[in-house]
């Protein structure tokens, strides 16, 4: 529990006062306000919302609220030259065209500036050719096609269903396979839950609904033209040919009505197994090309989107700390949306707004947090986490010296079943302790704690009686803070039941149908799940900013390091002969993990009984805790991914959304049996074991007694 140290606090100004001030009705009101028009990054509407949030945060009582602007590369469809896909006959005539826009939802027919579905940063082009169906376009799907089925995608247009992995990885995989275009579509198997109606009568995706999204492979670079540095007024910008992460082939998304028209004619090979079949009434033939009667027909893409350097605006609010103003706890979430942003991001932004209001209320009553709290409304998250990354690049020296923690606040809900938390192991105990103090909003758990309902519905696969907490991956604004800068990070939201709902994300993700009504009618009419998420996110920020000793437990890192070392060793041991031939040993890594475990245990003992009234010793111990996450950063970064610098965690090279442990070793081992030069490949495995072992040992030593 947080203590009421002498920071102008009266007994009522504790965590309870902060939590009691959070109101579901306010979150509902804020969500409505934020979702009435589109707030696409780089548009006037989103600039106006930034100024509104700035004004309201000032009213709520923050010490300062500033706009931080950057000029970054964004991507938009051509308003006079729409993007679409055709089926053309042998004479080149278009006999079928995909739709140019989504039918607007009821009540929104007259809203202007709804951006039509597009794949942001697609290059222009009009490729035509035979279609190949590539399932989810995952690495393993292309292995199946190329290695097992001997199907060559070179010079073909591929069609892939959304889901399972980040869309940018799909496009990268298609490019590597030699495809000349990519069509992405939402299959009902992944975006239509059985027994639920489609919007506006339920929360399922209608046939005309389409998922927008960027298709970059930035690997943490931020603005593609200014990797590593802020896109400010004196920035040096790369030429577009040298830009980071841009796709090289045209890409376009469609809904399942249009996909049906393309897939129903597919010929060639049958699907290899049932995992390649979706729920449409089509054969899911792989191709290449159309079946007999239609074999002379081809698919043609018409993509005319443009990339433009455009100004974006972050809102940065500060609540100065009373005791340690040079220690920053950050709560950030994005503001830009693809269209209305009913869930993504405004269900998160509304929660941040209410958290700011509650903190502001306490501040107006004379309270201050021990440490400084920074609040951020990020811009251009949907275009590659650009706002957060540029701000972190601009402030990297301050952040690496002063950053205590970052709590992310994108969508508060992706379902209404149970809590979902991804965070650094340093925060496990904080999350456990906090959720034990909060009431569960779930039906059937009245009077029970959030911890109890969460543990029951989402149990840890390793530890009985504890809830599942996942690794941080990417695909959201914590990326630069955690993966690049090594600032302890976490995120929390309400999620679906993954066991019974196998669809990817939520069905209306990034479509025009993600409205206020979607949330208010179908997901959270009482806004009780939003309130719970506000309590979790806000409670974490409160504790991180206010507890005398930072609420980090380094022993939990020791536990996971052992688990991750065991896991990567077992992957390597699938190749026992090569490990022997090339003298591959994990002894150094296991030794480092053992040392870390012993040193962390001793540090925790010292943490229990040091003199907390001595400000120098207190600061010293807290700094060791704060800098532990930083100690896992390798300044050289991961191979070919210089902005992913965390040695223990990185976004998976095959799915940006997922986290991978010991990513350097994992990637060195991946598909190693196909590397043309095994000696070189196993040499890289050995090098990565060395880097990991050194890093764990070096991190352990930061927890040793300082003298």
């Amino acid at each position: 529990k947080s203590s009421n140290e002498a920071t102008n606090i009266t007994p009522k100004h504790n965590m309870k006062a902060f939590l009691d001030e959070l109101k579901a009705e306010n979150i509902k009101k804020f969500l409505y306000n934020f979702t009435q028009i589109p707030h696409l990054a780089g548009t006037e509407q989103n600039f106006q919302l930034a100024k509104q949030i700035q004004s309201q945060w000032k009213e709520f009582g923050l010490d300062s609220v500033e706009l931080a602007h950057y000029d970054v590369l964004l991507s938009y469809p051509n308003k006079t030259h729409p993007n679409y896909i055709s089926i053309i006959n042998e004479d080149g005539n278009e006999i079928f065209n995909t739709s140019l826009f989504e039918p607007p939802p009821p009540g929104y027919e007259n809203v202007s500036d709804i951006v039509p579905p597009f794949s942001a940063f697609s290059p222009q082009g009009m490729p035509e050719g035979d279609l190949v169906y590539v399932n989810y376009a995952r690495t393993e799907d292309f292995f199946k096609l190329e290695r097992d089925m001997k199907i060559n995608c070179s010079g073909k247009i591929v069609i892939a269903r959304y889901g399972k992995v980040f869309r940018g990885n799909k496009v990268k995989n298609a490019q590597l396979a030699g495809a000349k275009g990519v069509i992405l579509y939402s299959d009902p198997a992944d975006y239509f839950a059985p027994g639920v109606k489609s919007y506006p009568d339920g929360w399922n995706l209608p046939g005309g609904g389409v998922q927008r999204g960027n298709i970059l492979n930035l690997n943490g670079a931020g603005d593609p033209l200014t990797p590593g540095y802020p896109a400010n007024e004196y920035a040096y910008r790369r030429g577009i040919a040298e830009a980071v992460g841009l796709p090289s082939i045209p890409v376009h998304p469609i809904g399942y009505y249009d996909a049906q028209k393309l897939l129903e004619k597919m010929g060639g090979s049958a699907p290899p197994d049932s995992s390649w079949r979706g729920s449409l009434k089509v054969p899911y033939n792989v191709g290449p090309g159309f079946t007999g009667n239609f074999s002379t027909q081809k698919v043609k893409m018409h993509i005319h989107s443009t990339n433009e350097v455009t100004r974006i605006y972050n809102v940065i609010g500060t609540l100065r700390g009373a005791v340690e103003p040079d220690r920053y706890v950050i709560l950030g979430g994005h503001r830009d949306s693809w269209v209305f942003g009913g869930i993504d991001p405004q269900s998160g932004a509304a929660v941040v707004h209410e958290i700011v209001r509650s903190f502001g209320t306490l501040k107006k009553e004379g309270w201050r947090p021990r440490r400084t709290i920074l609040f951020a409304s990020w811009d251009a998250e949907e275009f590659g986490l650009l706002g957060s990354t540029e701000w972190a690049e601009e402030n990297s020296r301050l952040l690496q010296e002063r950053g205590v923690a970052y709590i992310n606040a994108d969508s508060s809900i992706e379902g209404n079943y149970t809590l979902r938390v991804d965070c650094t192991p340093l925060m496990y105990s904080l999350v456990h302790n906090l959720t034990k103090e909060l009431k569960s909003p779930d039906e059937g758990f009245e009077g029970k704690s959030l911890y109890e309902s969460w543990t029951k519905k989402s149990p840890s696969p390793e530890f009985s009686g504890m809830p599942r907490i996942s690794k941080l991956g990417s695909g959201n604004d914590f990326e630069v803070f955690f993966q690049r800068l090594g600032i302890a990070s976490g995120r929390a939201r309400y999620t679906k039941n993954w066991e019974t709902n196998k669809f990817s994300g939520y069905p209306l993700y990034h479509s025009v149908y993600e409205t206020y009504e979607l949330v208010e009618k179908f997901y959270d009419p009482m806004f009780k799940y939003h309130l719970t998420v506000a309590q979790v996110r806000g409670g974490m920020v409160f504790e991180l900013a206010n507890s005398i000793v930072l609420p980090f437990d380094c022993r939990d890192y020791a536990v996971v390091l052992r688990k991750y070392a065991d896991k990567i060793y077992s992957i390597s041991m699938k190749h026992p002969q090569e490990m022997k031939t090339y003298s591959v040993s994990f002894d150094s890594l296991f030794s480092a993990v053992k040392n870390f475990t012993e040193i962390a245990s001793k540090f925790s003992e010292r943490l229990q009984d040091f003199d907390k009234s001595n400000p120098i010793v207190l600061r010293m111990m807290n700094d060791q805790l704060m800098f532990l996450e930083r100690a896992f950063i390798d300044p050289l970064g991961l191979p070919d991914r210089p902005f992913y610098r965390h040695v223990i965690y990185a976004p998976s090279s095959h799915n940006k959304y997922a986290g991978e442990s010991f990513p350097g070793i994992y990637d060195a081992l991946f598909d190693i049996e196909s590397k043309v030069d095994p000696s070189k490949a196993w040499g890289e495995v050995k090098r990565q074991i060395y880097v990991a072992a050194f890093t764990v040992q070096a991190a352990a030593e930061t927890l040793s007694e300082v003298a």
């Epitope: 043309v676 030069d677 095994p678």
Partner: antibody, heavy 116, light 107 residues
Framework: SVKLQESGPGLVAPSQSLSITCTVS????????VSWIRQPPGKGLEWLGV???????YYNSPLKSRLSINKDNSKSQVFLKMNSLQTDDSAMYYC??????????WGQGTSVTVSS | TVLTQSPAIMSASPGEKVTMTCRAS???????LHWYQQKSSASPKLWIY???NLASGVPARFSGSGSGTSYSLTISSLEAEDAATYYC?????????FGAGTKLELK
């Protein structure tokens, strides 16, 4: 296109040493390994050893003490040296590009006869 | 690991289905079992890699299969140009080893 060309002395006296050069084109020795294989007249194939792109070498154990494989990346050349030749070392000697654990392109071979 | 090929010599008529086998003295990963074709006074050519993958230019009448210690090469319909010696090769640690070969002759 990928090519490998062996060049050797043809005739070697017993107890003398053998040096063969393999000159490659169409690929880089910094990316691929090269193996040496020999085939005595009318017999099967025997793998001698490999030099990988990182310079690591592995040899067939019974021959290890007599064999050495080196390379010059800049000249795209790989060198086989074999000491203390006996008549049963007479064979066609091939170099081959080594990909994973296959030899996917082979030279045309150079014939070596050990005789006084 | 010792590879034993059988038969050592076989003859078959054009159009016939032909199968030759390669047995390993200990288990070999299917990723590391390959076949080569050698015609008289020519260099060997990679013919089938990773048990079942045809090398570039190899006719589709050839196929490979197997796992563990037993592998085979099959020609669905023999043609005159297929007359050659076929060697299997494995890796399960150095040294790489070849079978003694199966010589395929035309009747």
């Amino acid at each position: 296109s990928v090519k490998l060309q062996e060049s050797g002395p043809g005739l070697v006296a017993p107890s003398q040493s053998l040096s063969i050069t393999c000159t490659v084109s169409g690929f880089s020795l910094t990316d691929y390994g090269v193996s040496w294989i020999r085939q005595p007249p009318g017999k099967g194939l025997e793998w001698l050893g490999v030099i990988w792109s990182d310079g690591n070498t592995y040899y067939n154990s019974p021959l290890k003490s007599r064999l050495s494989i080196n390379k010059d990346n800049s000249k795209s050349q790989v060198f086989l040296k074999m000491n203390s030749l006996q008549t049963d070392d007479s064979a066609m000697y091939y170099c081959a590009r080594h990909k994973v654990y296959t030899m996917d392109y082979w030279g045309q071979g150079t014939s070596v006869t050990v005789s006084s | 690991t010792v590879l034993t090929q059988s038969p050592a010599i076989m003859s078959a008529s054009p159009g016939e289905k032909v199968t030759m086998t390669c047995r390993a003295s200990s288990s070999v990963s299917s990723s590391y079992l390959h076949w080569y074709q050698q015609k008289s006074s020519a260099s060997p050519k990679l013919w089938i890699y990773r048990t079942s993958n045809l090398a570039s230019g190899v006719p589709a009448r050839f196929s490979g299969s197997g796992s563990g210690t037993s592998y085979s090469l099959t020609i669905s319909s023999l043609e005159a140009e297929d007359a050659a010696t076929y060697y299997c090769q494995q890796y399960s640690g150095y040294p790489l080893t070849f079978g003694a070969g199966t010589k395929l002759e035309l009747k």
